[in-house]
């Protein structure tokens, strides 16, 4: 039969290659079937018999068509500074992402080696650039007419309320205090909270920006609102 309609195993044409989802077995010198994702080669092909595939065992996986003798081990359970966003299945590895309030301070080839806690902005400073999956929060001083009275990795500077009669003027870390009962805002305050970074980095093995005023990245102590709980998610 011509190679394009041959059933595995078959000898390829001289100088030819095996088809999609097939591999060339050096021992048998034949084109043989690969195993589908979620399976592995239990018995390799011979000149007369094709590859025998078997399902991956618990906590192991294969993501691609393959002829590996054993499935890959899923990564260890997510560390307490991460959350499991994809469970370990026979066809895919576990994926761990940094928790809200964290970012990936130390990445690796696939995923995040260590999540780090986002810095917070002190009162009088607001978030100029929110944290992302791979960068830390950048803070800025609240401009005249605005304030932030929190220690937060999400709060921006908000405008002072405008008083008919001012009891206490506002400053960078405190809102104005009015004597009247119906203060107004100098502008629409907008969102007070910036969204937490959404991380899509995965972890496949064991766990573990240039700010305007202070260099470096944040560290490995969890921060609210979602600090790590004891223990972690299993398979």
């Amino acid at each position: 039969l011509p190679a394009q309609v041959a059933f595995t195993p078959y000898a390829p044409e001289p100088g030819g290659t095996c088809r999609l989802r097939e591999y060339y077995d050096q021992t048998a010198q034949m084109c043989c079937s690969k195993c589908p994702p979620g399976q592995h080669a239990k018995v390799f092909c011979t000149k007369t018999s094709d590859t025998v595939c078997d399902s991956c065992e618990d906590s192991t996986y294969t993501q691609l068509w393959n002829w590996v003798p054993e499935c890959l081990s899923c990564g260890s359970r997510c560390s307490s500074d991460q959350v499991e966003t994809q469970a370990c299945t026979r066809e895919q590895n576990r994926i761990c992402t940094c928790r809200p309030g964290w970012y990936c301070a130390l990445s690796k080839q696939e995923g995040c080696r260590l999540c780090a806690q986002l810095r917070k902005c002190r009162p009088g400073f607001g978030v100029a650039r929110p944290g992302t999956e791979t960068s830390d929060v950048v803070c800025k001083p609240c401009a005249p007419g605005t304030f932030s009275n929190t220690t937060s990795s999400t709060d921006i500077c908000r405008p002072h309320q405008i008083c008919h009669v001012v009891a206490i003027p506002g400053n960078a870390s405190m809102d104005a205090v009015c004597t009247s009962t119906s203060p107004t805002r100098s502008m629409a305050p907008g969102a007070v909270h910036l969204p937490q970074p959404v991380s899509t980095r995965s972890q496949h093995t064991q766990p573990t920006p240039a700010p305007s005023t202070a260099p470096g990245t944040s560290f490995l102590l969890p921060v609210g609102p979602s600090p790590p709980a004891e223990g972690s998610t299993g398979d």
Epitope: S79, S80, D81, A105, L106, R113, L114, A116, Q117, R119, K120, C121, R122, G124, F125, C139, K140, P141, T150, T151, P207, T208, P211, T213, A214, P215, G216, T217, S218, F219, L220, L221, P222, V223, G224, P225, S226, P227, P228, A229, E230, G231, S232
Partner: antibody
Amino acid sequence: EVQLVESGGGLVQPGGSLRLSCAASGFSLSTYDINWVRQAPGKGLEWVGIIYTGGITNFANWAKGRFTISRDNSKNTLYLQMNSLRAEDTAVYYCARGGYDSEGYVYPDAFDPWGQGTLVTVSS
Amino acid sequence: DIQMTQSPSSLSASVGDRVTITCQASESISNLLAWYQQKPGKAPKLLIYRASILTSGVPSRFSGSGSGTDFTLTISSLQPEDFATYYCQHGYTGTNVQNVFGGGTKVEIK
């Protein structure tokens, strides 16, 4: 002035329990992670555990199951409950804020300030 | 479990000497390292954070360097008030932590 003050230390028998307090002034405990660190006589610093801003706690492997940390925001006070105490738990216990303030930022990886420490002696 | 190995455990030096203390992490921690000074009967005092940033009020003779796994604390010209014990700290508090501090280096008068 930002300050932490520990209290509650003393002599306790092996197997006994003790609750240490850490009172904060000059800042709100609920906006910072707070650590407990101990130091046995003549030995180095040893991290005990942490309470995060959200109230969740985490501990060194050796402290899990025996020690708990809680917080009373209304009193701006932190507690370390120590159970099943052993002679090797004899140490000065410090509370330390996780968060150094600098140039508008709070750096959560650095411990500052620290309390003065309270001595716990476990002996029969 | 990230482990911090500090060396030497003790050293003798004279006033005016240049002193170097090293701290090695068992795995990379980027620049996320702090140094503390502790005097007998006192609580530790933060000297340096983020491996190289000097805490406000700390004399400029103290400096920190390093990234990844190897870090150094240097005192360029030792002063009488610098005789103390120094600790490095990594700060990770995940699921498998034994200690966040190095073993300490005691700087004594020669």
